[in-house]
Each structure stands twice: as structure tokens, then as C-alpha cells.
């Protein structure tokens, strides 16, 4: 969370941003809020990126003006125009690229004053893992797959019964480059699993951490997955 202040005459306006992460190839949001101003035509929103000449996006007089926009953002940006009057200056970013990572500035000017705040935007790839019982293996195994990760993550297994056990000797992890030659498919196999136990497959890089749990009993298989973005907020 970053809060910036600005001065216009005697007026401060508070601008607040949140560090966030973008999933490459997907759509992202760069969050920014400011003190609302009912005079829409008097609001100017400018998004800038460190090291880039030209703007990422500009919204003024109630509409977009991309005449100063840098080419790398062409056709990929929009503000939530109907939410500007209530103080939302967040930026939609289409088709997030690895090169979109960096420091952005959200600059606001209203009839109350002006202000700005920076945010760090991280980019990578992250996806939910899915764990299945691998019945084809000679001994009962678990197969954990996640379709898109970047940078290359670490993969670790854990078990509810054998807490603290190191499964690296009885697991095998591979990374397969996807067709766009950036992201990778993660596949990890855990061998010699026992029933009536809950196993967890944990995939983590510097952007996200994902966990897939599977409980195997004689009568059923229960699965659960979760994904958490790191260092955001």
C-alpha cells in the first residue's frame, strides 16, 4: 500500500496505490484511488511508467486521450470510466506482457488539488495446480500439474501424516516450455503414496504460491486448490 500526497495551492489530495502482480497473457489491474470529485470534466488521470517516454494512459475531460501513449501499451489500456467520479483511477491492462513489470505512477489532478503515488507491478505466470491419482504407475502415485508458471518455481510435497518429511527423494518434477516460449507447464509426481493421508503439492515463485491438496481414502478422493499472490497489497 502506497499513499501519496500532492499540493495545489493549499490543497492536498491523497492518492493510494497497491502493489500488484500480472499474469502474462491475461488481463491485469493496476489499482489507484483518490479523493472523489463530482466534477468529472475537471479530473485528469495520468498513468506513467518509469523508463518509458510517453504515457501509459491518460483520461481527461471525461474521456480517454491516448495521443501521448507509448506504443507498447497501444490498444491495451482503459480506466473504469464510470467509476472515476467516485475516486477510482485504476487501470485495466489487456494481455499482460513480461515487459510490463516495473514502477508505475498514478498522477491525479482534480478541482481539489493534485497528487500521485507509485506502485510496483510484477509480472509472471501462475496457475492452480491439479492433483490426480496416477493409476498407471507401478506403485500408487500422485501427479500434480499446473499449466502456466514463470519464472521457474520450486515444487515441494508435504503430507499430513508425515509432517516435516522430505519428499524430494520420492518425487520427480519436470518443467515443460509452453508454445509461447515463456511460460512453463509444471508436472511433479510423488511415488509410494499411502491411502488415508492428505498430500499437498506446493508451487512457488517470487510472485505467487499455489497449493493443491488431495486426500485419498478407500472410498473417495477429495481435492482442494488455492493460489496466493505474494507481496501484494
Amino acid at each position: 500500500l502506497i499513499i501519496g500526497f500532492g499540493i495545489s495551492g493549499k490543497h492536498f489530495i491523497t492518492v493510494t496505490t497497491f502493489t500488484s502482480a500480472g499474469n502474462i497473457g491475461e488481463d491485469g489491474t493496476l489499482s489507484c484511488t483518490f479523493e472523489p470529485d463530482i466534477k468529472l470534466n475537471g479530473i485528469v488521470i495520468q498513468w506513467l511508467k518509469e523508463g518509458i517516454k510517453g504515457l501509459v494512459h491518460e483520461f481527461k475531460e471525461g474521456k480517454d486521450d491516448l495521443s501521448q501513449q507509448h506504443e507498447m501499451f497501444r490498444g491495451r489500456t482503459a480506466v473504469f470510466a464510470d467509476q472515476v467520479v467516485v475516486g477510482n483511477a485504476s487501470l485495466r491492462l489487456k494481455n499482460v506482457q513480461l515487459t510490463d513489470a516495473g514502477t508505475y505512477t498514478c498522477y491525479i489532478r482534480t478541482s481539489k488539488g493534485k497528487g500521485n503515488a507509485n506502485l510496483e507491478y510484477k509480472t509472471g505466470a501462475f496457475s492452480m495446480p491439479e492433483i490426480n491419482v496416477d493409476y498407471n504407475a507401478s506403485s500408487e502415485s500422485l501427479r500434480c500439474e499446473a499449466p502456466r508458471w514463470f519464472p521457474q518455481p520450486t515444487v515441494a510435497w508435504a503430507s499430513q501424516v508425515d509432517q516435516g518429511a522430505n519428499f524430494s527423494e520420492v518425487s520427480n518434477t519436470s518443467f515443460e516450455l509452453n508454445s509461447e516460449n515463456v511460460t512453463m507447464k509444471v508436472v511433479s509426481v510423488l511415488y509410494n503414496v499411502t491411502i488415508n493421508n492428505t498430500y499437498s503439492c506446493m508451487i512457488e515463485n517470487d510472485i505467487a504460491k499455489a497449493t493443491g491438496d488431495i486426500k485419498v481414502t478407500d472410498s473417495e478422493v477429495k481435492r482442494r486448490s488455492q493460489l496466493q499472490l505474494l507481496n501484494s497489497g
Partner: antibody, heavy 121, light 107 residues
Framework: QVQLQESGPGLVKPSQTLSLTCTVS??????????WSWIRQHPGKGLEWIGN???????YYNPSLKSRVTISVDTSKNQFSLKLSSVTAADTAVYYC?????????????WGRGTLVTVSS | DIQMTQSPSSVSASVGDRVTITCRAS??????LAWYQQKPGKAPKLLIY???SLQSGVPSRFSGSGSGTDFTLTISSLQPEDFATYYC?????????FGGGTKVEIK
């Protein structure tokens, strides 16, 4: 409401330059919320996006045509134009001008009627 | 470039039929997909944008679904004026590309 109308010669000789203009009526090309595109359709075939322009003059072209295409804008006349150089019979098509529905959506919500351009000697 | 593959290339149907057209992208395009209707001698008309949003003025019998690589256009009850060619278009990545079209013909 906003309307688009293509104009230009219907017949162009091989190796020459195809020139078309799209006139926007009922709204200003400078309003800032849109990109303006050219799209073509070969006889009996599918659609091919040629490129687009913003009112400020910044352009983006389809890489397959980039070396031959120029799109320009004249805000005083509320027009944007297409030039395609070194044409061959393969450039015979119906050429449409269109408006992208927003600066991010990149779908085409308004189209001109289209104009058939034949490349023949 | 992202390739857009439509199927079938043509379909014969009767008034009142439910018609489904599919479009597959060669790579993920999130929900950045539009559908158009084109009648002979006319310009295409936008029906659906953002995969499932109905363009203003388009009848509710048209609907779109899908995300990622697989998308569907459905006409719930075919009307006489719906006999036309339908195109999908990806709006995710330059250059924007269209599918080859699906012709809906009278059975």
C-alpha cells in the same frame, strides 16, 4: 448517429498505389475514445485487418502488409485514409473502414458499406 | 499471429432450430473475442463482444460463451433474417485476426 463512408477509385493498375478515404459523419474523429481501422475482404473469402490509426496520427499495421501500407488522418476533414503501394491482383478486395468500439476492446462496432477495389491492367 | 478456426464451415438449418458455431484460437485470448454477422453485399455487423456481451440492438436469441481458446456462438431459435455468414475475431493481440466464417443456410 456516427456513420462511415469509404471513397476512392474502384480500379487500380498493378504496381500502382491504391488510395481510399473514409469520411466520418455524425461525430468527431478527434473525440479520443476510438481507434479507426481498415479491414479488407477478398472475394468470397474471410476478413483481414489491415491496420488502425488514432486521431493523433499514431498507427499500427498488420505485419503482413506493413511494408506497403500507410494510414493517415485529417482531423479537419474528419477523415482517415489508406494507401497500399505496389498492388497486385491479390489485393483485389472489398475494403471497409471501421471503428473500434473502445481504446481497449478492439472489436468493430461501426463499419462503412465497403468499396470494391479491383486490381487489373 | 493468432489463428482463429471456425467450425463448421457451413450448416444447414430450419427456422426455429438451435444453431451452435464454435471458434478456436491457436493460443489463449482470455475473453477478447467478438462475433459478427454478414449478409451478402453488406458489411459485417457486431453481435457479441468480450465473448458473451450482447451488442446493443442485437436480439437476445444470440448468445456467446467461452474463454481461453474455445468459444461458442449460439442462436437459440433461428429466424429467417439470421441466414448469413458468421465470423469470430480475436481482439487480444495485434494483428487482430478473424475466423474463416460459418455460413448458415436454409435446409
Amino acid at each position: 448517429q456516427v456513420q462511415l463512408q469509404e471513397s476512392g477509385p474502384g480500379l487500380v493498375k498493378p504496381s500502382q498505389t491504391l488510395s481510399l478515404t473514409c469520411t466520418v459523419s455524425g461525430g468527431s474523429i478527434s473525440s479520443g475514445g476510438y481507434y479507426w481501422s481498415w479491414i479488407r475482404q477478398h472475394p468470397g473469402k474471410g476478413l483481414e485487418w489491415i491496420g488502425n490509426i488514432y486521431y493523433s496520427g499514431s498507427t499500427y499495421y498488420n505485419p503482413s502488409l506493413k511494408s506497403r501500407v500507410t494510414i493517415s488522418v485529417d482531423t479537419s476533414k474528419n477523415q482517415f485514409s489508406l494507401k497500399l503501394s505496389s498492388v497486385t491482383a491479390a489485393d483485389t478486395a472489398v475494403y471497409y473502414c471501421a471503428r473500434e468500439s473502445s481504446t481497449i476492446s478492439a472489436d468493430f462496432d461501426l463499419w462503412g458499406r465497403g468499396t470494391l477495389v479491383t486490381v487489373s491492367s | 499471429d493468432i489463428q482463429m478456426t471456425q467450425s463448421p464451415s457451413s450448416v444447414s438449418a430450419s427456422v426455429g432450430d438451435r444453431v451452435t458455431i464454435t471458434c478456436r484460437a491457436s493460443q489463449g485470448i482470455s475473453r477478447w473475442l467478438a462475433w459478427y454477422q454478414q449478409k451478402p453485399g453488406k458489411a459485417p455487423k457486431l453481435l457479441i463482444y468480450a465473448a458473451s456481451s450482447l451488442q446493443s440492438g442485437v436480439p437476445s436469441r444470440f448468445s456467446g460463451s467461452g474463454s481461453g481458446t474455445d468459444f461458442t456462438l449460439t442462436i437459440s431459435s433461428l429466424q429467417p433474417e439470421d441466414f448469413a455468414t458468421y465470423y469470430c475475431q480475436q481482439a487480444h493481440t495485434f494483428p487482430y485476426t478473424f475466423g474463416g466464417g460459418t455460413k448458415v443456410e436454409i435446409k
